[in-house]
């Protein structure tokens, strides 16, 4: 067997860092065994099998003129083996972000806090942060640890599934090359990472009859589970064209009436999600739908929702009391605030 | 023990090609270099080249290498040189040695190659 | 290339005498060089290598010596079976060079 330890990385290849002393194994040989050793390509003898040093070479101070193969043979002539010496860094701490798109799951991305110019890998993995007792850190074997899995085709990025809402978890992070490993541990709780994708399916259409509406409605995003017991609450802006400054309001379900839109202009209108308890941060906006408020007076035949309205053929002024919120079909996935309110004091 | 059996000696004709051969037997084939040397009538030895063991990764001379050619046969344990554009002055014994990766410890008998038109 | 220089290029001596050999290159090669022996209608043989490395099977009568240009194989007591050509030879680059070599015969 060779006498070589068999670092982390492609076969054949030997590792050190510059400007140390670099110790390079001859592979097909019995330890100790003398042996000689040439440059691939470079036929004057480096070390001589007369050295002391068996079947290791040393290279004092590596630079980067020392990368490249090196040939060791036996005393008789016999190919001992070839070894790449590549030179680099040993790991250092790898940088560690984690976010979450929902309550359920969380994912944690990395990347080098240094380049170690070597081959590199990572290991994943995350526990349950929980005390035991009020003088005891020992972990339970609820409490992991257990793999992150990581995505495949090399993505930096390794996702939790079925992270619960309230605990805290600690990420583990570790960089791992030829030269040695080193680790990033990340204390995380979903509801400080939790930051939802934007809302999806936004429409915004004008009243007919009014000139300066425009209902915006929209949808939860898909990644957001189904169960009713956590909401998103939303953040609406919109603006006429060419208009530097958005509007805000904060709508109380899944749509919004414009009611002080500039008449004749496109406006464009984008919205944004958050739980609706505070936790974690808004998302980013959703790509922004354009609407242009209706010119011509109320049709006869009017909208269902429109049923409750006299027949103004004239906008109301800004102070007039605006008309009674269309009703919508309850999303399916949703209730109440206050039902939900209620439901997490039940909870609790 | 080791030996290195050369093919038989050739007359070529300028211009042309030859192929020496150089069966080997006795130690492992792929763990040892081959080398190619030549020397002319009385003359000094002459180093054409080399070919690695088990890559047959190879050097040449660089006086030869637009018309030298080394190849091995692993199955036969056999190494080849071929030399072409072949002209008078080739005319030499052609040695094959296994050595190390720079030395010649073993010999073949030799191949005479004798160039004349 | 690498030019092996050996003097001289006959030497007349008698057996039992000693022989020094001399090889000179034209560029410092450390001890990147080999000496081989040559008898009439057979193939070299090595003697000594890089300098003064002896090789197993080899009279020790042969040693070798020198390092960087200049190099000398002396052979303590000559031997009839010792009357041959001996050439040096360089590894220290490509391509691998040898000396014109310097034929030993008897006075």
């Known amino acids: 067997s060779s006498p070589c330890p068999q670092a982390w990385g492609p076969p054949g290849v030997q590792y050190g860092q510059p400007g140390r002393s670099v110790k390079l194994c001859c592979p097909g040989v019995t330890a100790g065994d003398p042996v000689s050793w040439f440059r691939d390509g470079e036929p004057k003898l480096l070390q001589g099998p007369d050295s002391g040093l068996g079947h290791e070479l040393v290279l004092a101070q590596a630079d980067s003129t020392d990368e490249g193969t090196y040939i060791c043979q036996t005393l008789d002539g016999a190919l001992g083996g070839t070894v790449t010496l590549q030179l680099g860094y040993p790991p250092a701490r790898p940088v560690v972000s984690c976010q979450a798109a929902d309550y359920e799951n969380f994912s944690c991305t990395w990347s080098p806090s240094q380049i170690s110019g070597l081959p590199t890998r990572y290991l994943t993995s995350y526990r349950k942060k929980t005390v035991l007792g009020a003088d005891s850190q020992r972990r339970s074997p609820s409490t992991g640890p257990w793999p992150c899995p990581q995505d495949p085709l090399g993505a930096a990025r390794c996702v939790v599934h079925g992270a619960e809402f309230w605990s805290q978890y600690r990420i583990n992070v570790t960089e791992v090359n030829p030269l040695g490993a080193s680790t990033r541990l990340l204390d995380v709780s979903l509801q400080s990472i939790l930051r939802p994708d934007p809302p999806q399916g936004l429409r915004v259409e004008s009243v007919p009859g009014y000139p300066r509406r425009l209902r915006a409605s929209w949808t939860y995003p898909a990644s957001w589970p189904c169960q009713p017991h956590f909401l998103l609450k939303f953040r609406l802006q919109y603006r006429p064209a060419q208009h530097p400054a958005w509007s805000t309001v904060e709508p109380a379900g899944l749509e919004e009436v414009i009611t002080d839109a500039v008449a004749g202009l496109p406006h464009a209108v984008r919205v944004s999600a958050r739980d609706f308890l505070d936790a974690g941060t808004w998302s980013t906006w959703s790509p922004e739908a354009w609407g242009t408020p209706s010119t011509g007076t109320i049709p006869k035949e009017i909208p269902a929702w429109g049923q409750l309205h006299t027949q103004p053929e004239v906008e109301p002024q800004v102070d007039s009391p605006a008309p009674p919120r269309p009703s919508l079909q309850p999303h399916p996935r949703l209730l109440d605030h206050r039902d939900s309110v209620e439901q997490v004091a039940v909870l609790a | 023990q080791v030996q290195l059996v050369q093919s038989g000696a050739e007359v070529k004709k300028p211009g042309a090609s030859v192929k020496v051969s150089c069966k080997a037997s006795?130690?492992?084939?792929?763990?040892?270099?081959m080398h190619w040397l030549r020397q002319r009538p009385g003359q000094g030895l002459e180093w054409i080249g080399n070919?690695?063991?088990?890559?047959?990764?190879?050097h040449y001379n660089q006086k030869f290498k637009d018309r030298v050619t080394m190849t091995v046969d692993k199955s036969t344990s056999t190494a080849y040189m071929e030399l072409s554009s072949l002209r008078s002055e080739d005319t030499a014994v052609y040695y094959c040695?296994?050595?190390?990766?720079?030395?010649?410890?073993?010999w073949g008998q030799g191949t005479l190659v004798t160039v004349s038109s | 290339d690498i030019v092996l220089t050996q003097s001289p290029a006959t030497l007349s001596l008698s057996p039992g005498e000693r022989a020094t050999l001399s090889c000179r290159a034209s560029q410092s090669i450390s001890n990147n060089l080999h000496w081989y022996q040559q008898k009439p209608g057979q193939a070299p043989r090595l003697l000594i290598k890089?300098?003064?490395q002896s090789i197993s099977g080899i009279p020790a009568r042969f040693s070798g010596s020198g390092s960087g240009t200049d190099f000398t194989l002396t052979i303590s007591s000559l031997e009839p079976e010792d009357f041959a050509v001996y050439y040096c030879q360089q590894s220290y680059s490509w391509p691998l060079t040898f000396g014109q070599g310097t034929k030993l015969e008897i006075k």
């Open positions: 040695a296994r050595g190390d990766y720079v030395l010649f410890t073993y």
């Open positions: 070919i690695g063991p088990s890559d047959s990764k190879t």
């Open positions: 006795g130690y492992t084939f792929t763990n040892y270099w």
């Open positions: 890089y300098a003064s």
